[in-house]
């Protein structure tokens, strides 16, 4: 976060003193962002309340100034500036020591690594012969005897420091005003030297010019006056901010200003200045913030206290140790492809002496527009410039050019950019198959825009529903099975196509309405009985273990294995438990099972029953007639059936009292050559019905029925008796 808190130490009059907080964040001060906050933080260092309330003056959305101090004590303590939005919201702290304090810090901000030893040193400004108390965040920490001063300094040594050791430390003479304390700020990075990230397993980029590696994100927090991902570039004198975009006010430039940056940097003088008031210029051979850096220029380079070594022509490098050579753009793709509306990052790498830097690399669009790099990565053998391209249009298709220019010369490389339009379906997806809880869908649809199709996203939800769409990403070449749906429910299904690359997702296509099937009929019937009622007739009964929750009827399946034929009988009445199957093939072995069905779905089958139908018999005997012989005898005569299906084994005669309710009686004529029979033992004056059929392998059809009455008024007979003979 680009946030700087400035204190102008040249101003000693409290009434003129002010603090300024500057945010250089891109898009800072958007209406949705919280405003910058600048205030005195009294939680640790408490002073008397100011004579009048401090007031904030805002200069636009990215700068705020705190004024209104009335007496020196108002200035002593901790000030904080808070800026940035959301997860990037950052607090910058400034610790102000009283110029008239008894004790004064040799160095206010100490940034150390986890596990390091930190030494806080307070030099005596106005001596008192009392003990010195050290405090951490306002709580007692340690006591030193006044005679323990070493060379006029009291030191606190903290070994193996850990992040919780961070905070505000103070050294105070016993019984002296807290305003006379030396206040320090200790910042302990969450990792050891050169490491960052969770578990501290990642390597820092190697921050230059006194930059400090952030232990959470690995970025370099650059000292005021330096920029670049590794703080490798010096700003022009008097400039600061992450991109050198801010300028120190007034003619004195950055003299007398203390700059406080986000942790783990802390505070320092601006580049080229040092001392407790930041008013001392660097000694020869030194440069940078607090003049902490040494030039050590070679090959005739001169030391500039703001930027370091200034190299003569033909040399470059931190110490002018590298000779120049013509820059060269390293391997680049000759053709790249982006999707319309995206804002791609295009990288261009170059080598050369001097090393290409941020401003030396540019990107030219087909319309002649020049883009400057937004980020530069410096590696030992190359500089890679990253260009953030504004939203692409079809007009951006064409030849782009990367250009590099240094004091060693220039180079350029052309490459072709193709801007593609993401695909949008023109048709709805197709339903291939359905079940009660799933739909099989073909997602392949015709589309507008550019291929190839890299992924297909299918969205579906119940018809007329306002719930969120369920999404499934599928292979474009395969059919999709939508699972765990509700039975008998309509679903809207639509497709979104994507092509390769960022922003390759096209819009939604038209939706199709697809309806799931009924729920399965889960009950299994049991076959209870089956009776042959004739050569081609079968009565079947079945049961169900309970009342079906869903079912439209039953399907009886008869499998004739010998002929490889299946007959299906649909009983479209779910309450049915019996059925008469007719028109079967006589003499056939059938395997029979029954299932419950619902809509088009079949439930589990019953165990199969094996049924053997008898073969069919011969046709009916012809010309049957009857003649009464006495009061107890009637003679029956007939002719053989026409074209019997084989040799007749016997005839069966059926006798029944006309109009009676009793069961009929049957008589076998075991000699098939006989076609006449005298039925004896009948009742006198009684009318009888007769019919006859032949048997070959199976029973044949009945003949016509004839009626005849016995004569006279004789005795009741025990029942009919037969006597037969050939006609």
């Amino acid at each position: 976060v680009d946030l700087t808190l400035l204190a102008n130490l040249r101003i000693t009059d409290p009434q003129r003193f002010f603090l300024t907080c500057v945010s250089g964040e891109a898009g800072a001060g958007r209406s949705s962002d919280p405003p910058l906050l600048l205030e005195k933080d009294d939680r640790i260092v408490r002073t008397f309340p100011p004579g009048q309330p401090l007031y904030l003056a805002r200069n636009g959305s990215h700068q705020v100034t705190l004024r209104g101090f009335s007496k020196p004590s108002d200035l002593v303590g901790v000030f904080s500036c808070v800026g940035g939005a959301g997860a990037r919201r950052t607090r910058v702290l400034y610790v102000h020591n009283s110029p008239g304090a008894h004790l004064f810090p040799d160095k206010v901000t100490h940034t150390v690594n986890k596990g390091d030893t930190a030494v806080l040193s307070a030099h005596v400004h106005k001596e008192k012969q009392t003990d010195v108390i050290w405090k951490n965040n306002g709580s007692y920490f340690n006591t030193l005897d006044w005679q323990e001063a070493d060379d006029g300094r009291f030191q606190l040594q903290l070994q193996n420091v850990q992040p919780p050791s961070s905070g505000i430390y103070s050294a105070t003479y016993l019984e002296a005003s807290p305003l006379g304390s030396a206040f320090f700020r200790l910042i302990v990075r969450g990792c050891g030297a050169g490491r960052w990230g969770p578990g501290c397993v990642k390597d820092c980029p190697g921050c230059l010019h006194g930059g400090v590696c952030h232990d959470h994100d690995g970025e370099c927090v650059c000292p005021p006056g330096f920029t670049g991902t590794r703080c490798e570039q010096a700003c022009r004198e008097g400039r600061f901010g992450q991109s050198c975009q801010e300028q120190c006010p007034g003619t004195a430039g950055c003299r007398g200003l203390t700059f406080c940056l986000p942790d783990p940097y802390g505070c320092s003088c601006g580049s080229g200045w040092r001392g407790s008031q930041c008013q001392e210029a660097c000694a020869p051979g030194h440069f940078g913030a607090d003049c902490r850096l040494q030039c050590q220029c070679q090959n005739g380079g001169t030391c500039d206290r703001f930027s370091g070594c200034v190299c003569p022509s033909g040399w470059h490098g931190v110490h002018c140790e590298k000779s120049d050579r013509i820059p060269q753009i390293l391997s680049m793709a000759t053709e790249v492809e982006f999707n319309i509306g995206t804002m791609p990052r295009i990288n261009c790498a170059a080598a050369g002496n001097p090393f290409p830097v941020r401003g030396s690399m540019k990107l030219r669009k087909p319309d002649g527009t020049m883009l400057l790099s937004t980020k530069v990565i410096v590696e030992p053998d190359r500089t890679t410039a990253e260009f953030e391209v504004p939203s692409l249009t079809l007009g951006d298709s064409g030849f782009w050019e990367c250009r590099v220019s240094t004091s060693g010369g220039q180079d350029s490389r052309r490459f072709k950019v193709n801007v593609k339009v993401p695909p949008v379906p023109l048709t709805a997806p197709r339903l291939l198959a359905k079940q009660s809880r799933q739909l099989v869908v073909s997602p392949l649809v015709s589309f507008s825009g550019d291929g190839p199709i890299s992924s297909v996203r299918l969205h579906y939800r119940p018809q007329d529903s306002t719930i969120a769409w369920s999404a499934i990403v599928v292979d474009p070449s395969e059919n999709v099975t939508l699972m765990n749906l509700k039975p008998k429910t309509g679903y809207n299904v639509r497709v979104q196509l994507s092509r390769p690359g960022e922003g390759g997702e096209g819009g939604w296509g038209p939706s199709a309405l697809m309806t799931t099937d009924c729920p399965e009929p889960l009950l299994q019937p049991w076959l209870e009985s089956w009776h042959v009622e004739g050569p081609d007739r079968l009565r079947v009964s079945w049961s169900l273990p309970s009342v079906p929750l869903s079912g439209d009827g039953f399907l009886l399946r008869l499998w004739d294995g010998a002929r490889g034929q299946e007959r299906r009988e649909n009983i479209s009445f779910p309450q049915a438990r019996t059925a008469l199957l007719t028109g079967l093939t006589p003499g056939t072995h059938y395997q029979l099972d029954v299932r419950l069905y619902h809509c088009t779905l079949l439930g589990p089958a019953s165990p199969p029953a094996h049924v053997h139908l008898p073969p069919s018999g011969p046709p009916a005997p012809r010309h049957l007639h009857a003649q009464a012989l006495s009061d107890s005898e009637i003679q029956l005569m007939w002719q053989h059936p026409e074209a019997p299906s084989g040799p007749i084994s016997k005839y069966i005669v059926e006798i029944q009292v006309a109009g009676g309710s009793g069961d009929p009686q049957w008589m076998d004529v075991d000699r098939p050559e006989e076609t006449s029979i005298i039925v004896r033992g009948l009742n006198a004056s009684t009318r009888y019905l007769f019919r006859v059929r032949a048997s070959v392998q199976g029973l044949g059809d009945w003949s016509n029925t004839v009626e005849e009455a016995t004569l006279g008024n004789g005795l009741q007979s025990e029942g009919p008796v037969r006597e037969s003979r050939a006609a």
């Epitope: 889960l522 299994q524 049991w526 019953s606």
Partner: antibody, heavy 120, light 107 residues
Amino acid sequence: EVQLLESGGGLVQPGGSLRLSCAASGFTFSMYGMVWVRQAPGKGLEWVSVISPSGGNTGYADSVKGRFTISRDNSKNTLYLQVNSLRAEDTAVYYCARAPRGYSYGYYYWGQGTLVTVSS
Amino acid sequence: DIQMTQSPLSLSASVGDRVTITCRASQGIGHYLAWYQQKPGKVPKLLIYTASTLQSGVPSRFSGSGSGTDFTLTINSLQPEDVATYYCQQFNSYPHTFGQGTRLDIK
């Protein structure tokens, strides 16, 4: 508590016969279909036979059709498997299990099994 | 008869792994499928019935899915006590055939 207890297993010569029984308790026996499942030593499960609650409807695996007969006596809460013409490959633990009444297709209740060994 | 084919026939996995066993029917069987677990010397135990319904008392790391011809048993985070042989069985039509079984052990 539903319990199924098989008995009748033992050593028998090829071509011999046995009658396996399964005594059921803890549920209304006449309301449930019953099955026999077998498992040869070190091998997988093999479905053998089923009988309907009334006993009128039976089914068999092809490997035992014509040799095994399943029956039940609802008055005695007992399931039977008459095994004839035994072969070496019929050596297995024979389990009886209660068939589902519908909806929940799976055998939840099993007996502990009875071992049939066919060997000369 | 409907054939049930399980794959793999054996597999080794580490504790905490996600394990998937598949069962394929030679013809469509709707949702009429059960999964069993059998430990050595023990009676089979019903895990999943009607393809995806978890039997009461079975840990929720077990789940079943599929319909028609392709079915899956998934163990979300393998535990040492899950070492066993797993069988599928179809209930669509008689004979109610089982798969060959999948032997699962711990690496």
